[in-house]
């Protein structure tokens, strides 16, 4: 189709090289057809249009996304040739960062319903660089957390180095939707609750005497509770004996309960303890059994081919530890007579 | 309960202060204080909120940004700045306490403001 | 700031009878909405929040439905103690939840 019609909205995306991010694209079609694809309705229902063109679908996903090669190659199905680009919706996600995800991306609505609709697509110039300036320190993350039940806030990293008096208009969304009050390059959250989560995009207006182009942030905000303040608990085993045949294999589990910690290192272990000696076993990966809000369970097994005589003689010593500290629980093997 | 004062006749351009009074509850988080008006036989007009927990954060309607200051004065007060009055400021003027999505709503009986010359 | 454009203005219905409020937000509030009935001389008192969950002491009789930015609120078996007028109101603000514009109201008469 010929996109010479379609509207332009040049963006620019400076990527940390130092950490992982991502970023978004909005099918930003024309009011009122975007409302019926995308559902981000932004009329008052004052503001009925003359004619409403794109009547054809209210299914979200019926836009479509192109990248226009540099080399003048015919458009290319997004979902097709960029496994790393992910398409929700009415918002393509980038996966990684990377200046080779530049260039120029186009959406249109599937169906085409009627003659207005040939034009009703959005031409997107990303350009896509390394920061390079370090004279900004401290540059809020793109992944910040929240206190649930505290008052919080969320940076824009593209501005966080500035004031908010010498701060441009920002625009912010979160889950693709238009939060239109928030203007300022921070959100402060007076209570902060589970509905907070979730991804914000924060754009700002930047010009030259040419041109100007939006310039886009994308920060992963997650609802988290306070650190715990308890080393973790021993929930199996909990006897400190356990019967056992002679010559059978034997699984002994460890489950351990380890609250939240927003940097979070938890030990599990098993070491043997005979007589004097004692040594860590080399047993199967930890793995996480259940995870909430507040803690984790984690599982470590430790696997005896065969029960052996001089294994009643040992102590099998389950250690797991956080930050906070550490707590052992040990098993005496007993004949089952 | 809640209760609102500095209701009063005045004259258009004169400037009025409202106070909310708070009893048997004082303000803390999760709770926002705001005020809303209701103009005689007309609907209700929301003017602005403040956050009674740590932000203190503060919301305005748009017409009212400029005219109207809300401000948390106490642990159970809040108070209305009103400035430059004129005769369609005329309303019966309430004090709320409110937390948007639940169950928490709380009204006062409202005080009456009169623009007149 | 969000424009909240209820309909009708005025509904008159029988006792026994079923009355429909509309309420359009001029933008997605999601499920951020509160129903309010008032009475001559009164502040307001709260029905519905979240725009489907009855406030305590609230009858069953009244029922809200919607989201994003279409909103019903439904009084079925009506009784003349319904005779009020009845309005909506958003309640988040960016991502505060702040009960802020209000809709214009309908007045329920009871014949």
């Known amino acids: 189709f010929n996109i010479s019609g379609c509207s332009t909205k040049k963006l620019l995306w400076t990527y940390s090289t130092r950490s992982e991010e991502e970023f978004v694209l909005f099918c930003d079609l024309p009011e009122p057809q975007k409302s019926h694809f995308c559902h981000r309705n932004r009329l008052s229902p004052k503001q009925v249009p003359e004619h409403l063109p794109f009547m054809g679908s209210n299914d979200l996903s019926d836009v479509q996304w192109y990248q226009q090669p540099s080399n003048g190659d015919p458009l290319e199905d997004i979902r097709k040739s960029y496994p790393h680009i992910i398409q929700d919706k009415c918002t393509l996600h980038f996966l990684t960062p990377g200046v080779n995800n530049s260039g120029s991306y186009i959406c249109r609505p599937k169906m085409i319903k009627s003659p207005y609709d040939v034009a009703c697509c959005v031409k997107m110039i990303l350009e896509v660089k390394p920061q390079t300036n370090a004279s900004c320190e401290y540059s809020a993350s793109h992944k910040q957390d929240l206190l649930l039940g505290s008052t919080g806030s969320i940076s824009c990293p593209s501005l966080s180095c500035q004031s908010d008096a010498q701060s441009p208009a920002v625009t912010w969304y979160k889950n693709g939707k238009l939060l239109s009050v928030e203007r300022s390059n921070r959100i402060v959250v007076d209570e902060v609750y589970d509905y907070h989560q979730g991804t914000y995009v924060c754009d700002y207006t930047q010009s030259d005497t040419v041109s100007s182009w939006t310039v886009r942030a994308v920060v992963q905000v997650r609802t988290i509770v306070g650190d715990t303040k308890l080393k973790p608990d021993i929930l199996d085993p909990v006897e400190d004996t356990l019967e056992v045949e002679l010559g059978k294999p034997l699984t002994i589990s460890c489950k351990a309960r380890f609250g939240f910690e927003r940097v979070f290192n938890p030990v599990i272990k098993w070491y043997i303890k005979d007589s004097d000696l004692e040594w860590e076993v080399s047993v199967p990966e930890a793995k996480s059994i259940k995870s909430t809000l507040k803690d984790e369970i984690i599982e470590r097994n430790i696997i005896l081919e065969k029960v052996t005589q001089r294994d009643l003689r040992r102590k099998f010593v389950c250690f797991v530890q956080n930050s906070i500290g550490n707590t052992t629980q040990s098993v005496q093997l007993k004949e089952k007579r | 309960s809640l209760e609102e004062s500095g209701g009063d006749l005045v004259k258009p351009g004169a400037s009025l202060t409202l106070t909310c009074t708070a009893s048997?509850?004082?303000?803390?988080?999760?709770?926002?204080m705001c005020w809303v008006r209701q103009a005689p036989g007309k609907g209700l007009e929301w003017i602005a909120c403040?956050?009674?927990?740590?932000?203190?954060?503060t919301y305005y309607a748009s017409w009212a940004k400029g005219r109207f200051t809300i401000s948390k004065t106490s642990s159970t007060t809040v108070t209305l700045q009103m400035t430059s009055l004129t005769a369609a400021d005329t309303a019966t003027y309430f004090c709320?306490?409110?937390?948007?999505?639940?169950?928490?709503?709380?009204w006062g009986p409202g005080t009456l403001v009169t623009v007149s010359s | 700031d969000v424009v909240m454009t209820q309909t009708p203005a005025s509904v008159s219905e029988p006792v026994g009878g079923t009355v429909t409020i509309k309420c359009q937000a001029s933008e997605d509030i999601e499920s951020f909405l509160a129903w309010y009935q008032q009475k001559p001389g009164q502040p307001p008192k709260l029905l519905i929040y979240s725009a489907s969950t009855l406030a305590s002491g609230v009858p069953s009789r009244f029922k809200g439905s919607g989201s994003g930015t279409q909103f019903t609120l439904t009084i079925g078996d009506l009784e003349c103690a319904d005779a009020a007028t009845y309005f909506c109101?958003?309640?988040?603000?960016?991502?505060?939840?702040?009960?802020?514009?209000f809709g214009g109201g309908t007045e329920v008469v009871v014949k």
């Open positions: 048997g509850f004082s303000f803390s988080s999760s709770y926002y």
């Open positions: 109101q958003c309640t988040i603000y960016g991502v505060n939840f702040v009960p802020n514009a």
């Open positions: 709320a306490r409110d937390r948007g999505g639940t169950d928490i709503s709380l």
């Open positions: 403040v956050y009674a927990g740590s932000s203190g954060s």
